[in-house]
């Protein structure tokens, strides 16, 4: 059954009217409008776009649209003192310098204010030294280097290829290894798909293209100077030395033409195995230092970027609910881009714009949603999810009491192969039911449902006949809502075929070549994938805001809790002797999961049977559903990560983009065999099992009959 039938929700014609109003041509037009100039956070260009969106959302019919500003720490290159990397000879002369900017794409040669490639929040510095190639700079790459190959990165400049994990984790790992600088580069193995031309003739990365991005390790803090509190006019700001998450060593990104010049001279150890080789015609030697003839040459970084407290602007639109105006369903995506933002974020912002227009059209015809819908155009996402986090910090008391759900709306596409969804288990059934009602845009699936094409192309690894839905990690604006506040969250976009395309993200990510033309020529000429994503995101918002009973199924949480408990138990059982020695038991966790399963099952039965015409009982049942996600929040947060408070999910400590289940237990077990005090380490494992078991049990009890 669809969730409409299952919960006796709004007449279908309203949902149909909403979906029918969404037009691919409008999304295309909005994308064009949003991508003609750069919209870097903290610039007048991006402020003007905020005011334009505010004005248009008002025209579309929202009840109110306000700008919410904050003064946060951002980072910019020095306009008169550019960043670059050199090879220097024994006399200190620069014999090679990396490029200062990306060659602009055709048609954009005269555009001003294109920020040159830089690593946001890099400290200033001019370190020089020998180079060490560290593969992707993942935790396991440094284990390989230090433990197996006995290579010491202390005092070295490391060069790492982009991909696999969030760049901030790479920098953190390099710092912990003692490096004095980091060079990040895009290897064609990860950013050049075989058989495709480079931009402007295809969607691959040219040799002069460079990925920008922040290198913070904020762990959900938001503005580095005001963790936990909004960066408003009367904020108390930390000194820069106490700021959260700033890197301590200079970092700079380069393209593969420049990387070739650095890597071709590398000497020292050979790569440990083929997984360390990219696609450049270089040996991928690890170093340290250059080979034979070049052994006296060194690498020198010249980094002059500055951190500045800068004003940012969110746009917040409200469509007041007719029945439950104090219950908020939020659709949010960012507006700021590194350059033109053809995919990130404007393919998402254009979809949000069309969703707002459609909702506004219905409202002008006399319709209102049951619950309030909030629409957000976030600023400074690229600088650490700052706009969304500051707004949530400012409104945390309202959100924790009234927040029903948050749907994220960054890039609508990262490919054009199939749907990709990451969400709370509470939304699994909503997503399944909705995608069964939508038409697939895929070739070969004419007349078939989106659910069918998605399931065929991206099957669930556990359940046959169902599509894969992934865990929420981070690296986007849902983070504060889900990981800190415990508001049920989800995201959806069209993605690539992960089987055949091994590159990380999409090749032109965060480069100057991420233009309107990239999307219109190569990814989605008919904007049919954008339209589908609009239908999924908009449809989820519609259902969440309009269902009489919230379209959450707590039984799906029970299923995944068991799966996650089994997984973490298996990891722990790799150490059977220590588990015995230190009396480590998972019984409490499995017992709590069993209780959760039984209570969730009973709750679901009551949900089918209760009198939906009784507004008090209806509100009570809905509140139990709304507050279930909240019940997984530990007010003390995870160890050393106070703003990651969700006990079931957190961003991986080794890759911010990835979600980890039972993260407290996972981190306590990670590399436990290397801990100097095993008794203390296993004690922490036991404590984390206790926290997890308690939290699951406590969450289960929120679903019990109230009296």
């Amino acid at each position: 059954k669809s969730s409409n039938e299952a919960t006796n929700i709004t007449p279908k014609h309203n949902m149909k009217a909403f979906l029918d109003e969404l037009k691919a041509e409008n999304i295309k037009k909005f994308l064009y409008n949003f991508t003609q100039i750069p919209h870097l956070a903290g610039t007048e260009q991006n402020f003007q776009l905020a005011k334009q969106i505010q004005s248009q959302w008002k025209e579309f019919g929202l009840d109110s649209v306000e700008l919410a500003h904050y003064d946060v720490l951002l980072s910019y290159p020095n306009k008169t003192h550019p960043n670059y990397i050199s090879i220097i000879n024994e006399d200190g002369n620069e014999i090679f310098n990396t490029s200062l900017f990306e060659p602009p794409p055709p048609g954009y040669e005269n555009v001003s204010d294109i920020v040159p490639p830089f690593s946001a929040f890099s400290p200033q510095g001019m370190p020089e030294g020998d180079l060490v190639y560290v593969n992707y700079a993942r935790t396991e790459d440094f284990f390989k280097l230090e433990r197996d190959m006995k290579i010491n990165c202390s005092g070295k400049i490391v060069i790492a290829r982009y991909g696999k994990v969030f760049r901030g984790n790479k920098v953190k790992n390099a710092q912990l290894a003692g490096a004095k600088g980091v060079i990040l580069y895009s290897d064609p193995a990860d950013y050049f798909a075989p058989g495709v031309k480079s931009y402007p003739d295809g969607w691959n990365l040219p040799g002069g293209g460079v990925q920008r991005g922040n290198i913070l390790n904020l762990n959900g803090a938001g503005d580095p100077l005001t963790p936990g509190y909004p960066a408003n006019e009367y904020a108390y700001r930390r000194g820069i030395a106490e700021a959260v998450g700033l890197p301590s060593i200079p970092v700079h990104p380069i393209g593969y033409y420049d990387a070739q010049k650095l890597l071709e001279k590398m000497g020292g150890s050979a790569p440990p195995d083929s997984s360390w080789r990219g696609s450049l015609k270089v040996p991928y030697n690890v170093g340290p230092g250059f080979t034979g003839n070049f052994s006296t040459q060194k690498v020198k970084m010249h980094i002059h970027s500055t951190n500045e407290v800068t004003r940012i602007y969110n746009v917040i639109g409200t469509l007041r609910g007719a029945v439950e105006p104090d219950r908020y369903v939020i659709l949010g995506g960012h507006r700021d881009s590194w350059v033109f933002g053809g995919i990130d974020p404007q393919s998402g912002a254009a979809v949000v714009h069309e969703i707002v227009r459609s909702f506004g059209t219905l409202k002008k015809e006399g319709w209102r949603p049951r619950r309030t819908i909030l629409f957000a155009s976030w600023d400074a996402e690229e600088f650490g999810l700052l706009g969304s986090t500051e707004w949530a910090e400012e409104n945390s008391r309202l959100l924790q009491e009234r927040g029903v759900a948050y749907i994220n709306a960054d890039s609508s596409i990262e490919g054009n192969y199939t749907l990709r969804v990451d969400c709370t288990p509470l939304m699994y059934s909503l997503v399944h039911n909705l995608t069964k009602e939508l038409k697939s845009p895929d070739e070969g699936f004419e007349g078939k449902s989106l659910y069918e094409s998605w399931t065929k192309k991206s099957p669930s690894p556990e359940f046959s006949g169902m599509p894969r839905i992934s865990k929420l990690g981070s690296g986007n604006d849902f983070e504060v809502f889900f990981q800190r506040l415990g508001i049920a969250s989800g995201r959806a976009r069209y993605t690539k075929n992960w089987e055949t395309n091994k590159f990380s993200g999409y090749p032109l990510y965060h480069s100057v070549y991420e233009t309107y033309e990239l999307v219109e020529k190569f990814y989605d000429p008919m904007f049919k994938y954008h339209l589908t994503v609009a239908q999924v995101r908009g449809g989820m918002v519609f259902e969440l805001a309009n269902s009489i009973v919230l379209p959450f199924d707590c039984r799906d949480y029970a299923v995944v809790l068991r799966k996650y408990a089994d997984k973490i138990y298996s990891i722990s059982m790799k150490h059977p002797q220590e588990m015995k020695t230190y009396s480590v038991s998972f019984d409490s966790l499995f017992s709590a999961v069993k209780n959760f399963t039984e209570i969730a099952s009973k709750f679901s039965e009551r949900l089918q049977d209760f009198d939906k015409s009784n507004p008090i009982v209806l509100r009570m049942m809905n509140d139990q559903l709304m507050f279930l996600e909240r019940a997984f929040i530990d007010p003390l947060g995870l160890p050393d990560r106070p703003f990651y408070r969700h006990v079931i999910y957190a961003p991986s400590s080794h890759n911010k983009y990835a979600g980890e289940s039972f993260p407290g237990i996972y981190d306590a077990l990670f590399d436990i065999e290397s801990k100097v005090d095993p008794s203390k380490a296993w004690g922490e494992v036991k404590r984390q099992i206790y926290v997890a078991a308690f939290t699951v049990q406590a969450a289960a009890e929120t679903l019990s009959e109230v009296a």
Partner: antibody, heavy 121, light 107 residues
Framework: QVQLQQSGAELARPGASVKLSCKAS????????ISWVKQRTGQGLEWIGE????????YYNEKFRGKATLTADKSSSAAYMELRSLTSEDSAVYFC??????????????WGQGTSVTVSS | DIQMTQSPSSLSASLGERVSLTCRAS??????LNWLQQQPDGTIKRLIY???SLDSGVPTRFSGSRSGSDYSLTISSLESEDFVDYYC?????????FGGGTKLEIK
């Protein structure tokens, strides 16, 4: 609507100082800076410098460093320029103009009506 | 400092005529150029920002363009209130500099 209201004409002796004001209204004062521009009779325009009240940062044209001092008062949404050691070369109309406070901006969008300064013994 | 050479310094034209004013930059300024209009009473108004973007409320007969280091302000059909002074302003790098101005007079 955005308005920059400048103080009235000044007549000053050589060697004296004057302090011109520019009172802003119709927008959030701390989201923008104020630039100051000089125009001598029948001449073109010269940029003196700018101040960003939110941060308190000032930037000067080297030519006017030591001649002009820019200040701002957030509580009254006003910017000020003090000109010291006046000579006849300082006789001009001085304009204030609004400029966005950000890494990239489009320079001066709204202008005050100008204040005439005459230096004469 | 970046020099902005504005031409012509004065221009006589008739009502309804199409005219173009030019500023040449001594260094690359990208699209960081504005056009300003000054009334006889001294009032200054920005017409064009970022080379070609029209400020709100400015008539569409005004347009801006660029060719290499030359920047132009074009008035497609002169009206009586257009016969005033015009300046270009570069804001690509500090100190910001202005063109010498063009006085547009009625023929």
């Amino acid at each position: 609507q955005v308005q920059l209201q400048q103080s009235g004409a000044e007549l000053a002796r050589p060697g004296a100082s004057v302090k011109l004001s520019c009172k802003a209204s119709g927008y959030t004062f701390t989201s923008y800076g104020i630039s100051w521009v000089k125009q001598r009779t029948g001449q073109g325009l010269e940029w003196i410098g700018e101040i960003f009240p939110r941060r308190g940062n000032t930037y000067y044209n080297e030519k006017f460093r030591g001649k002009a001092t820019l200040t701002a008062d957030k509580s009254s949404s006003a910017a000020y320029m003090e000109l010291r050691s006046l000579t006849s070369e300082d006789s001009a109309v001085y304009f204030c103009a609004r400029v966005f406070d950000g890494y990239y901006n489009y320079a001066m969008d709204y202008w005050g009506q100008g204040t005439s300064v005459t230096v004469s013994s | 400092d970046i020099q902005m050479t504005q031409s012509p310094s004065s221009l006589s034209a008739s009502l309804g005529e199409r005219v173009s004013l030019t500023c040449r930059a001594s260094q690359d300024i990208g699209s960081s150029l504005n056009w300003l209009q000054q009334q006889p009473d001294g009032t200054i108004k920005r017409l064009i920002y970022a080379t070609s973007s029209l400020d709100s409320g400015v008539p569409t007969r005004f347009s801006g363009s660029r060719s290499g280091s030359d920047y132009s302000l074009t008035i497609s059909s002169l009206e009586s209130e257009d016969f005033v002074d015009y300046y270009c302003l570069q804001y690509a790098s500090s100190p910001y500099t202005f063109g010498g101005g063009t006085k547009l007079e009625i023929k």
